[in-house]
Amino acid sequence: MMTGTIETTGNISAEKGGSIILQCHLSSTTAQVTQVNWEQQDQLLAICNADLGWHISPSFKDRVAPGPGLGLTLQSLTVNDTGEYFCIYHTYPDGTYTGRIFLEVLESSVAEHGARFQIP
């Protein structure tokens, strides 16, 4: 039975040209995290594997940095980076947990962070 929950940074906004940290946290389970995949819509951005470490998509090699922790840092943001991001936690023995973050990249200099929310 899957008892865990994923807490994410929720709906967030950031300025064009700036950077943002995408964070998820898995709680309420003793399952072992074997790998975390970060995806943007259907595109794989990065993988953090317990054995193999971090591997970043060549398409994002200059704009994506691993961490902090199991999070992901997006740099040199453009308006095209607006959209849904998913953290996919592969765990044993529970299986897969998915968290969703919506990022809006703003032209303006005012970028408010949204509240945290949980996905069971």
Partner: antibody, heavy 120, light 107 residues
Framework: EVQLVQSGAEVKKPGASVKVSCKAS????????MHWVRQAPGQGLEWMGL????????GYNRKFKGRVTMTVDTSTSTVYMELNSLRSEDTAVYYC?????????????WGQGTLVTVSS | DIQMTQSPSSLSASVGDRVTITCKAS??????VAWYQQKPGKSPKLLIY???NRYTGVPDRFSGSGSGTDFTLTISSLQPEDFATYFC?????????FGGGTKVEIK
């Protein structure tokens, strides 16, 4: 035209090491991951690990950890796979394979293979 | 590790036959599955990626389908050059793993 050209067949004694090379051409070498996959005679395919020529980042299948090392020479667009402490079960054809453009974990081009025979 | 169980391990078919090969993953791999063709003494060649996307230059008689744990490679009308061994591969989770292969032989 993308080409991956591997070094020639090797015969090694148990306990020895082997170093197989894979020279890439026809594309931007640092834009794609390279993987190593082996195939024992008459058997299936086994993934050994990957290396990213852009930053020399590596990741190894835990089955081979401590015995395998993957390296890159960007000046010659060549990747190397060295396997230590050889045993008879390591007799196989070793392939380098380029990671795909949309996801680096499937293989769109393969080298011709290098037969490594381990025999006393 | 994710096990990819491929079936059948071999099959005999005639030119013009419709051939179906299946691959079952031991856990959900979404659509991160590729299919390869390998002829004796040769390197594998990519046929399908993302479960159903035909790779450049691959004839349209080859098609892939499935998601989650169950995947299928179909050859709609077998041609003489299609007699070979076919492998599936999952690429959701490291270590990357392959099915055991299906050898397609001439009946």
């Amino acid at each position: 035209e993308v080409q991956l050209v591997q070094s020639g067949a090797e015969v090694k004694k148990p306990g020895a090491s082997v170093k197989v090379s894979c020279k890439a051409s026809g594309y931007t070498f640092t834009d794609y991951y390279m993987h190593w996959v082996r195939q024992a005679p008459g058997q299936g395919l086994e993934w050994m690990g990957l290396v990213y020529p852009y930053n020399d980042n590596t990741g190894y299948n835990r089955k081979f950890k401590g015995r395998v090392t993957m390296t890159v020479d960007t000046s010659t667009s060549t990747v190397y796979m060295e396997l230590n402490s050889l045993r008879s079960e390591d007799t196989a054809v070793y392939y380098c394979a380029r990671g795909g453009p949309s996801n680096w974990n499937y293989f769109d081009y393969w080298g011709q293979g290098t037969l490594v025979t381990v025999s006393s | 590790d994710i096990q990819m169980t491929q079936s059948p391990s071999s099959l005999s078919a005639s030119v013009g036959d419709r051939v179906t090969i299946t691959c079952k993953a031991s856990q959900n791999v979404v659509t991160a599955v590729a299919w390869y063709q390998q002829k004796p003494g040769k390197s594998p060649k990519l046929l399908i990626y993302s479960a159903s996307n035909r790779y450049t230059g691959v004839p349209d008689r080859f098609s892939g389908s499935g998601s989650g744990t169950d995947f299928t490679l179909t050859i709609s009308s077998l041609q003489p050059e299609d007699f070979a061994t076919y492998f599936c591969q999952q690429y959701t989770l490291y270590p990357l793993t392959f099915g055991g292969g299906t050898k397609v032989e001439i009946k």
